[in-house]
């Protein structure tokens, strides 16, 4: 009797188990009692990345330079184009449909991880003993100056935004 379920890489239609089209090809006609599934390769600007029964291939993604995008990896008949962002920008989502400038870490914060084309700058608060007095997308928190190594004393304590101020030691009268 006609099957109710089919093997892997097959699909059920009109009581027939038909072969799916391989990645890079689209369905032209279903199999019949007397014929195989017929598939055709996707055109140059299209792709299908799975075993499928799609009658249309998907268009490759367009990396729009007006949105700050550029091609990281050209698409094939089996893979989509991968976009990334131009220098100084990163993707707004995993699918990378547009780009925004990397954020800078404000004073009191340093760069934990420099931004890439697909990820934003990661900032971290400067811990005790470190500071950042600039807004930057590259600079880490810097350690306070060690007055002792210069035979100086701390005249003004450091904060997460400022370095310590060193001064000469008081002379005994």
């Amino acid at each position: 009797e006609p099957p109710t379920a089919c093997r892997e890489k097959q699909y059920l239609i009109n009581s027939q188990c038909c072969s799916l089209c391989q990645p890079g090809q689209k369905l032209v006609s279903d199999c019949t009692e007397f014929t195989e599934t017929e598939c055709l390769p996707c055109s140059e600007s299209e792709f299908l990345d799975t075993w499928n029964r799609e009658t249309r291939c998907h268009q490759h993604k367009y990396c729009d330079p007006n949105l700050g995008l550029q091609v990281q990896q050209k698409g094939t008949s089996e893979t989509d184009t991968i976009c990334t962002c131009e220098e100084g920008l990163h993707c707004t989502s995993e699918s990378c449909e547009s780009c925004v400038p990397h954020r800078s870490c404000l004073p009191g914060f340093g760069v934990k991880q420099i931004a890439t084309g697909v990820s934003d700058t990661i900032c971290e608060p400067c811990p005790v003993g470190f500071f950042s007095n600039v807004s930057s997308a590259f600079e880490k928190c810097r350690p306070w100056t060690s007055c002792e190594t210069k035979d100086l004393v701390v005249q003004q304590a450091g904060t997460n935004k400022t370095d310590v101020v060193c001064g000469p030691q008081d002379r005994q009268r």
Partner: antibody, heavy 112, light 112 residues
């Protein structure tokens, strides 16, 4: 329900061209399947002559050399057989078929 | 061409008894995808052929389950588990893996 119906002259003179039409109802000939012509000489077995596919492309039995043409009229959902330079050996019942569904057949006699 | 050879050509059977028809091909009917397009047809006197079995072993819609098909490669069999009076006719195998499609010569089943 898919139905096929052959039509055409039952008598053809030797050396002339045999022409038959198959009208299909219940299914579009452009949707899928191969649409075949098969013949059966009186008291003999079946012989596949050729087909026209849903996309309009053809395949013919090499035994019929260059005598056979299968065409279609999609507006009427029909496909047709032309067999040129016929002889008495082409006398047969001619069937159009999708293979799972067949016409009732039409007897064509080649005689002067 | 794939030459299809059926045996026996004549098969007298007692009602209620089983019957078996063999069909051998001159070349393998398994295609590159591992599918085999071997079909069985029944033709009763004065009627068009009727599809019984497709792709070696699949019964076509409405065909009684006393009919079964088996085989692979080049050797195929049609079995009738218990012959009934209405099964009288000629049985043909047809391969549609290779072009040209080719029929066996036919096996005439009759009641003893």
């Amino acid at each position: 329900q898919v139905q096929l119906q052959e039509s055409g002259p039952g008598l053809v003179k030797p050396s002339e061209t045999l022409s038959l039409t198959c009208t299909v109802s219940g299914y579009s000939i452009t949707s899928n399947y191969y649409w075949n012509w098969i013949r059966q000489p009186p008291g003999k077995g079946l012989e596949w002559m050729g087909y026209i596919r849903y996309d309009g492309s053809n395949n013919y039995n090499p035994s019929l050399k260059n005598r056979i043409t299968i065409s279609r009229d999609t507006s009427k959902n029909q496909f047709s057989l032309k067999l040129s330079s016929v002889t008495a050996a082409d006398t047969a019942v001619y069937y159009c078929a999708r293979l799972d569904y067949w016409g009732q057949g039409t007897l064509v006699t080649v005689s002067s | 061409d794939a030459v299809m050879t059926q045996s026996p050509l004549s098969l007298p059977v007692t009602l209620g008894e089983p019957a078996s028809i063999s069909c051998r091909s001159s070349q393998s009917l398994e295609n590159t995808n591992g599918n085999t397009f071997l079909n069985w047809f029944q033709q009763k006197p004065g009627q068009s052929p009727r599809l019984l079995i497709y792709r070696v072993s699949n019964r076509f819609s409405g065909v009684p389950d006393r009919f079964s098909g088996s085989g692979s490669g080049t050797d195929f069999t049609l079995k009738i588990s218990r012959v009934e009076a209405e099964d009288v006719g000629v049985y043909y195998c047809l391969q549609v893996t290779h072009v040209p499609f080719t029929f066996g010569q036919g096996t005439k089943l009759e009641i003893k």
